[in-house]
């Protein structure tokens, strides 16, 4: 896969992903009422991070917000948190990306810089997307824990007339917003892995390396940290073999005007 | 200003069937679910099912499932409700009546009286 | 089936008494998600209609005069009628509005005397 398309890829998914996280941030089913033990509801209970819904069965549905900081529960406020720095994350790494594209021209920006921001980009959409999941995953553990500590204590009786009286507690199970956030954080990781392989694609084979040059009777020896390479050239009309050093020429290149790189 | 108004008395021979309607007037048909209730001379109110005028999809007691068919048509803003196998026990007064915020009914209809009589 | 259970059945009072009516649930009908109960009172006078009076337990219906106020929660339920008018002749159910099937009280008759 070329590097503007493995980069363009990578994008779409982020931006894809990042729509995802909004849309699940944004949502109220976080939570929906299990009807498992209560199947002919007329009431329907589902919360999100920001309001908690009622729908009845004549179809009218009030939602009310949550106006308190102090009386929410401390893991709901960390996936608010978890939520909004992955959107905020998200932001940033879209519009850098955008500067980013190779297929985007952008003044005198050269490769390097796009390779640099391509990498910020997609490690911001990784982070961004990381957050997302640990956010909706927290919440699930929540449900989850909730779940069967409120099973454990579903029916309590009471005495009433003719013996006992039935109280229902309402549980809670997965909402879509779940699902929906899963599906984004991971897409938005995904897009922000793409974007960290376009990157070394925008960057020349050796440039992750230190080089020093000898020059000796006409040829040119590169040694590399981290095993021995070395490229020799023989003969008066052997070209000095191109190595860069962010972004720096050796002396010999002034011919040398590549319009491609070996992809890594 | 909202109306149900509901078909005329009947009297139908035992193991038959009747269908009853339930005209709607003065708001938005498919915006509000329609429930039916029966009522037997001198005693209470028993909850038969609803259909949604939007879905068209109903939701049956139990103890009524089978022999009542609700259905509504959108374009006269009608509900119907048809029931079968009639016996003496039917004999009652079938109400239609509109549900609201709540859960509650706020508009009835006036009643068709239904007698199973041979 | 949520059994609604009404008591008394009947009643008989003079003009402008305070009446009280009950109604209770074997069920909880409380939904934790908006803290309502839904429990609704409807008076159905002689050769009418039922009339929808009160929702949610407490929520007076628009028209609906202000001497009749309902209160309870949970599972226990009451009607007040302030001061009993010749009109409010009639009998009155409640209803379960809670879960399906709806079900409906055996009424309690309001005579005047």
């Known amino acids: 896969m070329s590097v503007t398309a493995c980069q363009g890829l990578g994008f779409v998914v982020s931006l894809i992903g990042f729509a995802g996280i909004i849309a699940a941030t944004c949502m109220d089913q976080w939570s929906t009422q299990d009807l498992y033990n209560n199947p002919v509801t007329a009431v329907f209970n589902y919360q999100g991070l920001w309001r908690s819904c009622v729908r009845e069965s004549s179809g009218f549905t009030e939602c009310r917000g949550y106006f308190t900081l102090l009386g929410l529960p401390a893991m709901l406020q960390a996936v608010r948190a978890l939520m909004i720095v992955g959107i905020v994350l998200g932001v940033i790494g879209i519009l850098v990306s955008i500067f980013a594209l190779k297929c985007i021209r952008i003044g005198s920006m050269d490769d390097s810089a796009k390779a640099k921001m391509t990498l910020t980009s997609g490690i911001l959409f990784i982070i961004s997307g990381i957050c997302a999941i640990i956010g909706v995953s927290v919440f699930a553990n929540m449900l989850v824990t909730n779940f069967w500590m409120s099973t454990a204590n579903m029916y309590s009786g009471m005495g009433g007339m003719g013996g006992m009286v039935q109280t229902v507690q309402t549980r809670y199970t997965f909402g879509a917003a779940l699902f929906v956030g899963w599906v984004a954080g991971g897409l938005t990781l995904i897009g922000g892995v793409m974007m960290c392989i376009a990157c070394r694609g925008l960057t020349p084979d050796d440039s992750n390396f230190k080089a020093v040059s000898y020059h000796a009777s006409g040829q040119n020896v590169a040694y590399r940290p981290g095993g021995f390479k070395a490229s020799t050239g023989f003969g008066s009309n052997t070209r000095n073999k191109k190595i860069y050093d962010g972004g720096a020429r050796t002396e010999d290149d002034e011919q040398s005007h590549p319009t491609k790189y070996d992809y890594v | 200003e909202v109306q149900l108004q509901e078909s005329g008395p009947e009297l139908v021979k035992p193991g038959a069937s009747v269908k009853m309607s339930c005209k709607a007037s003065?708001?938005?048909?498919?915006?509000?679910?329609i429930h039916w209730v029966k009522q037997k001379p001198g005693q209470g109110l028993e909850w038969i099912g609803y259909?949604?005028?939007?879905?068209?999809?109903?939701k049956y007691n139990e103890k009524f499932k089978g022999r009542a068919t609700l259905t509504s048509d959108k374009s006269s803003s009608t509900a119907y409700m048809e029931f079968s196998s009639l016996t003496s026990e039917d004999s009652a007064v079938y109400y239609c009546?509109?549900?609201?915020?709540?859960?509650?009914?706020?508009?009835w209809g006036q009643g068709t009286s239904v007698t199973v009589s041979s | 089936d949520i059994v609604m259970t009404q008591s008394p059945s009947s009643l008989t009072v003079t003009a402008g008494e305070k009446v009280t009516m009950n109604c209770k649930s074997s069920?909880?009908?409380?939904?934790?998600?908006?803290?309502?109960?839904?429990l609704t009172w409807y008076q159905q006078k002689p050769g009418q209609p039922p009339k929808l009076l009160i929702y949610w337990a407490s929520t007076r219906e628009s028209g609906v005069p202000d001497r009749f106020t309902g209160s309870g929660s949970g599972t226990d339920f009451t009607l007040t009628i302030s001061s009993v008018q010749a009109e409010d002749l009639a009998v009155y159910y409640c209803?379960?509005?809670?879960?399906?099937?709806?079900?409906f009280g055996s009424g309690t008759k309001l005579e005047i005397k």
């Open positions: 009546a509109r549900l609201n915020r709540g859960n509650a009914m706020d508009y």
């Open positions: 259909i949604n005028p939007y879905t068209d999809g109903p």
């Open positions: 069920q909880s009908l409380l939904n934790s998600g908006n803290q309502k109960n839904y």
């Open positions: 209803q379960n509005d809670y879960s399906f099937p709806f079900t």
């Open positions: 003065g708001y938005t048909f498919t915006n509000y679910i």
